[in-house]
Interface confidence: medium
């Protein structure tokens, strides 16, 4: 766990992520990292005649030399980066104060990093971090050069064979947005058939025309025979 | 904590290499972010360079940005600050220090752990 402390004193603002550093999570998944703290002095007041501070949360993610705060809460609201929006969230606060918590969804390879828990309350801040390591890596698999040639079933076994498993759509999706192309149409763990375009071309629109992003034949009958994609956790 | 052992600091010419070492021992060395900091005489002790735990997250100060790679081997508890294209600015006392915590602009405060530091001088 990683816990760091402003000052020597028992009654300082402290804050900590009771996790072991790095984090080793799976792509397409999502994240809790749990943060807390403790404030022994709340609360913290400017002057009689004002209400208390409230304490102040921030998260940050500090990768490739770039700091990037995700969001801030205070007082009950959470404002979140926008580029974030739909991506990162606090499930505990503010129904539990002390709780900052960060939920990440649907992780990316560039979502690695180092994540910040920053609580500020007056003049006093804290903060803990915790090293995330995206794994897994999506790739397209074809039997020997021949398309689609693979049912639903031989279409597993043909990941287990490459020492990986079948892709979820959440993986696919991952990958895509890490910047996957393939104009392939492969099987995926819940029986969909999709493939992930960037620059949509003839032969490659689905059911998405000129638009980017990951093509669905939806659920398809097992014996349908089409490509693969698998999942690994390591390439060697 | 951890004990931090540095060397492989000398004498080298502007242009040229060396490669610091910095030897942990004690528990759980890959828990550590690690850093390279460095004094001139008369000046601050100023942030070289931070990895994080796996290593895989690195940051730099500008001025050794592109010239100086850090790295580390936890099987071998230790971590490495490669230094090429010297300039006789980079005259100092390099110490190597151990903290749980990890920015984009680290300061001393964020390390619990120091080694005695090791002498890099460059000439003209």
């Known amino acids: 766990a990683v816990t760091v402390e402003t000052s020597d004193h028992d009654n300082s603002l402290s804050v900590s992520i009771p996790q072991p550093s790095p984090l080793r999570v799976l792509l397409g998944t999502s994240l809790t990292i749990p943060c807390y703290f403790i404030d022994p002095m709340h609360p913290v007041t400017t002057a009689p005649s004002t209400a208390p501070l409230a304490p102040r949360i921030k998260w940050s993610r500090v990768s490739k030399e770039k700091e990037v705060v995700l969001l801030v809460a205070t007082e009950g609201r959470v404002r979140v980066n926008s580029a974030y929006q739909d991506k990162v969230s606090l499930p505990n606060y503010p129904a539990i104060p002390s709780d900052a918590t960060l939920e990440v969804q649907s992780l990316r390879s560039n979502d690695s990093g180092v994540y910040r828990c920053e609580v500020m309350h007056g003049i006093e801040d804290s903060e803990a971090t915790l090293e995330v390591v995206v794994k897994g890596i999506v790739f397209h698999y074809r039997a020997i050069s021949t398309r689609y040639t693979l049912d639903f079933d031989r279409a597993q076994r043909a990941c287990l064979q490459n020492s990986a498993i079948i892709a979820t759509p959440e993986q696919l999706q991952a990958a895509y947005e890490d910047g996957f192309h393939q104009c392939d149409a492969g099987w995926l763990a819940d029986q969909t058939v999709r493939y992930p375009i960037h620059t949509p071309r003839e032969g490659c629109y689905g059911d998405k025309d000129e638009f980017p992003g990951v093509r669905t034949y939806g659920i398809r009958d097992t014996n349908e025979t089409y490509d693969v994609y698998c999942f690994a956790e390591e390439m060697e | 904590e951890v004990q931090l052992v540095e060397s492989g600091g000398g004498l080298v010419q502007a242009g040229g290499s060396l490669r610091l070492s910095c030897a942990a021992s004690?528990?759980?060395?890959?828990?550590?972010?690690m850093g390279w900091f460095r004094q001139a005489p008369g000046k601050e002790r100023e942030f070289v360079s931070i990895?994080?735990?796996?290593?895989?997250?690195?940051v730099y100060a500008d001025s050794v940005k592109g010239r100086f790679t850090i790295s580390r081997d936890n099987a071998k508890n230790t971590v490495y600050l490669q230094m090429n294209s010297l300039k006789p600015e980079d005259t100092a006392i390099y110490y190597c220090?151990?903290?749980?915590?990890?920015?984009?602009?680290?300061?001393?405060?964020?390390?619990?752990?120091w080694g005695q530091g090791t002498q890099v001088t460059v000439s003209s």
């Open positions: 990895i994080s735990w796996s290593g895989g997250s690195t």
């Open positions: 004690g528990r759980s060395f890959s828990s550590y972010a």
């Open positions: 220090a151990a903290g749980r915590l990890y920015r984009a602009t680290p300061r001393p405060a964020d390390f619990g752990s």
